[in-house]
């Protein structure tokens, strides 16, 4: 008689990343008997929820259930029915909801309550929805990329995961850019972390890590743009804002009420003699860069070194994975290649921003105008943030690797979050050998 294939002994987990601009659902899978091995968990599905981030549903919470339906139904299809009940579902909300909570805790709670009610209706093991801290967001992003890169494995490998890799055991730093916040997380070299709020201690797979992390609320790309507009409109002579961060010929009307809706613009708020103003693009990278730099005004630095806003930042150390919007924006601009120097990136940004809006629209006809119009700002912002904000140099730029996926799993905080909540990262080194790894994209 022929041997019958045994059913796969696998487990699944679902994490929803409720970001400021959108929600994504990730499905992870791993062999049940190898839970404690490093590198065995991988992503099998990403489902991007249609619509904005959950914080935008504050006045229409009754629509949240429908909003989540498609992706939750997709999860139902992907995961075998027999495993639905034992599959944990976690929802983590990030800076968009942190900002809403700052405005009104009650409204933030109401949104999360409805999210929880909706997710409880599915056959999975729903574990609740919560607003994760900026520190968690940074830490779990760091765990994710290092887990996927095999940095926690104590086994010596004959192959290299990445072409430029030197010391296999040196962890990567993590650079995460969202719509409302940005995180920087890395292991500093023999440097005491002068600010306790920025220090994390981990013991993972038998090794201790002293990690620096900080989340800059309001410095995600969307909130940074709102900040820049609020700052620049203060000195505008009328209701026309000539903006170097938008392409020549680009025009857009902005409501002052929308500009001042977010807590991120409070520091620039003033009474303006108009209810609306018009952005008129002039497409000048250098001027855009200068305007953005004003957002990084380093008031006083009570430490040996600061990033900006008086926040401690140790000297940068080692290689960094830059993901989420760092990757999406640079990928669109075709600037993710290892071979592109910082000087070349700057040159290309100058050319891109100077291109007329009509030309840009024709060249990228398939891209939504809302997103297309903001790539000049976003690209310039990424350069400004990395160079002036975090003090990368032309030389250390080569240590930044723009990463979308590693071994088919998205770089981001969600995998690290699930690994932690399912107790799949042991403090001590397990005895079994890890799986092999392939390269990242």
């Amino acid at each position: 008689t022929q041997n019958k294939a045994l059913p796969e002994n696998v487990k699944y987990g679902i994490v929803l990343d409720a970001g400021s601009s959108h929600t994504s659902l990730y499905i992870y899978k791993w062999p049940a008997e190898k839970e404690n091995d490093t590198g065995v968990v991988h992503q099998v599905e990403e489902c991007r929820v249609k619509g904005p981030g959950i914080s935008k549903f504050v006045q229409k919470v009754n629509e949240i259930g429908i909003y989540l339906t498609d992706c939750m139904e997709r999860a139902r299809e992907v995961i075998p029915r027999s495993q639905h009940q034992e599959t944990p579902v976690y929802l983590g909300a990030t800076a968009g909801m942190r900002l809403l909570r700052m405005e009104s805790e009650e409204l933030a709670d109401r949104v999360l309550d409805v999210v929880e009610r909706s997710l409880s209706n599915y056959p999975f093991d729903f574990q609740g929805a919560r607003i994760i801290t900026g520190q968690e967001e940074g830490a779990y992003g760091w765990i994710t990329i290092n887990y996927l890169l095999g940095k926690f494995s104590q086994k010596t490998r004959w192959f290299s995961i990445v072409p430029y890799e030197t010391n296999n055991q040196e962890t990567f730093g993590a650079l995460d850019l969202g719509g409302a916040s940005t995180q920087v997380t890395f292991v500093p070299q023999n440097q005491t972390i002068e600010s306790p709020d920025n220090a994390l201690q981990f013991r993972l797979y038998g090794k201790d890590y002293n990690v620096y992390t900080h989340s800059f609320l309001c410095y995600g790309k969307d909130q940074a743009l709102w900040q820049k507009l609020a700052k620049d409109i203060q000195v505008a002579s009328n209701e026309i804002l000539r903006d170097p961060c938008f392409h020549p010929g680009y025009k857009k009307v902005v409501n002052v009420s929308d500009l001042y809706k977010t807590p991120c613009t409070k520091r620039f708020e003033m009474t303006l003699p108009f209810q609306q103003f018009e952005i008129q693009g002039i497409g000048n990278y250098q001027q855009c860069h200068q305007s953005i730099l004003e957002l990084f005004a380093t008031a006083g630095c009570p430490y040996s070194q600061c990033a900006f806003a008086g926040i401690f930042l140790p000297p940068l150390q080692g290689d960094f994975g830059a993901f989420s919007a760092f990757y999406f924006v640079m990928k669109f601009l075709n600037l993710t290649s290892e071979k592109v120097s910082q000087e070349k990136v700057t040159e290309m940004m100058k050319k891109f921003c100077a291109q007329p809006w009509e030309e840009i629209k024709t060249s990228y006809a398939g891209v939504k105008e809302k997103y297309l119009s903001e790539y000049c700002f976003s690209g310039t912002y990424i350069l400004s943030l990395l160079l002036q904000g975090y003090h990368f140099t032309a030389d250390s730029w080569e240590h930044i690797h723009f990463i979308g996926k590693i071994q088919g799993s998205d770089a981001g905080w969600t995998l690290g979050y699930m690994l932690n909540l399912t107790n799949m990262i042991p403090a001590e080194q397990p005895l079994s050998t890890p799986l092999s790894h392939s390269t990242y994209v």
Partner: antibody, heavy 121, light 107 residues
Framework: QVQLVQSGAEVKKPGASVKVSCKAS????????MHWVRQAPGQGLEWMGR????????WYAQKFQGRVTMTRDTSTSTVYMELSSLRSEDTAVYYC??????????????WGQGTLVTVSS | EIVLTQSPGTLSLSPGERATLSCRAS???????LAWYQQKPGQAPRLLIY???NRHTGIPDRFSGSGSGTDFTLTISRLEPEDFAVYYC????????FGGGTKVEIK
């Protein structure tokens, strides 16, 4: 809608213990802390402590430490408050009250109907 | 622990009048950590104001909160018959404490 339903009135002798329950419904039980507050007849409100139903961690007011125990049963969405070594001055109405989500601020949004505990020999 | 002192102990007013209730802390309290509750006889307390000045869902706009540091105020702009009750302030700083209460009674 959110409801907190408490167990019925109790009469206890001095030195005994009392266990009051509070059953929550209408929301995700694990997501909000639960507090206990008491009110002696004709007196003001006195905070006793809180429990995080997600992990079971507790924080008790100094005055009640060693005498109060707060627990939860996630399968029934119920929290319990047990007070031991009862004395006459523990005669009061005991309220459970839903507190904050993690990262929120400590105010008590929703209260149970109260449970009268009378301590008398 | 932070002690909250409410004054006056009793406030005798007529419907339609303005009520001003005071809550003083023994040390500075972050505004986000101060709340006000209303309690009627035989009922559980009800949250009115949180974060010193934010009205809880469903609370009429005649109720307003203000203050910072050690001095906080609850104002009822025009007393309605249903507003006659006891009012408590509450703070959070490691532990929760309540003020002794102010009784608003009909004159």
């Amino acid at each position: 809608q959110v409801q907190l339903v408490q167990s019925g009135a109790e009469v206890k002798k001095p030195g005994a213990s009392v266990k009051v329950s509070c059953k929550a419904s209408g929301y995700t039980f694990k997501s909000y802390e639960m507090h206990w507050v008491r009110q002696a007849p004709g007196q003001g409100l006195e905070w006793m402590g809180r429990i995080n139903p997600s992990v079971g961690s507790t924080w008790y007011a100094q005055k009640f430490q060693g005498r109060v125990t707060m627990t939860r049963d996630t399968s029934t969405s119920t929290v319990y408050m047990e007070l031991s070594s009862l004395r006459s001055e523990d005669t009061a109405v005991y309220y459970c009250a839903r507190g904050k989500r993690e990262g929120g601020t400590e105010y008590l949004r929703k209260w149970g109907q109260g449970t009268l505990v009378t301590v008398s020999s | 622990e932070i002690v909250l002192t409410q004054s006056p102990g009793t406030l005798s007013l007529s419907p339609g009048e303005r009520a001003t209730l005071s809550c003083r802390a023994s040390q500075s309290v972050a505004s986000s950590y101060l709340a006000w509750y209303q309690q009627k006889p035989g009922q559980a307390p009800r949250l009115l104001i949180y974060g010193a000045s934010n009205r809880h869902t469903g609370i009429p706009d005649r109720f307003s909160g203000s203050g910072s540091g050690t001095d906080f105020t609850l104002t009822i702009s025009r007393l309605e018959p249903e507003d006659f009750a006891v009012y408590y302030c509450q703070q959070y700083h490691n532990a929760i404490t309540f003020g002794g209460g102010t009784k608003v009674e009909i004159k």
